[in-house]
């Protein structure tokens, strides 16, 4: 079957199923029997989804988080909101812009000496895998006895890309998030139609490596809009 190749960052030049972009939460998805598509999967049910723009933080862009747009509004209606800058109020890390984290309800700078030391309570070599927290408290508990934690290797559970070793990013993998390789030149990449449009991706590819961008492959310009092949190409 194509299961493994469609799930791997290591495979080059495969056409991206469903045009490389998945549907929004609540949209219909389909998959050919036995074939695992980024936008739909015979093993997945989406019964928890509401027909709204996002359900979890990782469905939004890196500078966004998922929340109700109005204070005290309907908890079911969630959209991707702009991240909060330093010194702004927060309830969880994902609300804070990259380079910051949520501490005592305020977004603060995640410099090497504090955030890196906030490792999971058990000092395990795996990290939490979902950006969403429902209790409003920050995800991790400070343990001052161990201030540094080795970076996750490929296949390690992670919380965000900074948990992963160099050359890896933290990407969704079914109900978890794991460290996966940053894409190399010529590898298939996922070009989202807009930021946060990967609501139904059951796995995510990493982004393209330094000096590369995700663009339509030249010989695929004639293809229909829904089947254009995106690969990592030199700027």
């Amino acid at each position: 079957t194509l299961n493994s190749v469609l799930n791997s960052n290591a495979i080059k030049n495969l056409p991206p199923p469903l045009g490389g972009a998945a549907g929004h939460p609540g949209s219909a998805v389909s998959a050919a029997p036995g074939i695992l598509y980024p936008g739909g999967n015979k093993y997945q049910t989406i019964d928890n989804y509401q027909p709204y723009p996002c359900a979890e933080d990782e469905e939004c862009g890196t500078d966004e988080y998922c929340a109700s747009p109005t204070r005290g509004g309907d908890a079911g209606v969630q959209i991707c909101l702009a991240c909060r800058k330093r010194r702004k109020r927060c309830m969880r890390h994902a609300m804070c812009c990259p380079g910051n984290y949520c501490k005592n309800g305020i977004c603060v700078s995640s410099d090497q000496n504090n955030f890196r030391g906030e490792i999971e309570e058990t000092i395990t070599e795996s990290f939490g895998n979902d950006h969403s927290t429902l209790d409003g408290y920050s995800r991790r508990t400070t343990l001052s006895s161990k201030m540094y934690h080795s970076k996750g290797q490929e296949g390690s559970v992670c919380l965000r890309s900074s948990d992963c070793a160099t050359g890896l990013c933290c990407a969704r993998h079914f109900w978890s998030k794991i460290c996966k390789p940053v894409l190399k030149e010529g590898q298939v990449c996922t070009k989202h139609r807009r930021k946060g449009s990967h609501g139904l991706e059951i796995f995510q590819r990493c982004y393209c490596g330094e000096g590369l961008s995700c663009r339509i492959q030249k010989d695929h310009h004639q293809a229909s809009n829904s089947s254009r092949l995106h690969t990592c190409q030199r700027h």
Partner: antibody, heavy 115, light 108 residues
Amino acid sequence: QVQLVESGGGLVQPGGSLRLSCAASGFTFNNYGMTWVRQAPGKGLEWVSGISGSGSYTYYADSVKGRFTISRDNSKNTLYLQMNSLRAEDTAVYYCARTIYMDYWGQGTLVTVSS
Amino acid sequence: DIVLTQSPATLSLSPGERATLSCRASQNLFSPYLAWYQQKPGQAPRLLIYGASNRATGVPARFSGSGSGTDFTLTISSLEPEDFAVYYCQQYLTLPLTFGQGTKVEIK
């Protein structure tokens, strides 16, 4: 320390229902995807279902799809497996475990489906 | 589905000996999304290795994992009495998640 404690197993007739619970402690529960795995007597391990930290993503093995429902209550730090239309072949010890590779496991709860 | 075949089915060794357990996947995993577990009678499994070669927390250094593609190996450099158990491999590249049938390491 991380602890997972399953409950709710027992003897049920074919076609019957059971709801398993898994009480979690010692870690920030809603950060973690959770997994159910089962083991028939004297047999190997079989993946049953998985759910993301917020509960928005759920996945099932073909053998249980449409009969079993995985869910979680993050306010109670509890994972559930609702099992309907049970069959003799569902007889097994059911384990809850943390993450997609199972870094912590509960002690298991035995489900026996027999008439 | 990816089928994982473990060999040998049973390994009879003495304490202090080296144990080499094999796990072969029916298709290339391409990525090191493979874990190893130890299970003793009447107990839940215990994670030993994830990401093909990363030791889990609290696992002794005598356990090591290696391999890529379709062939993976768990090595126990010098068997201790508590290491006699059943060992399972598991892939988490694709769904359904699948386990090998297990290798029993028994005292010779």
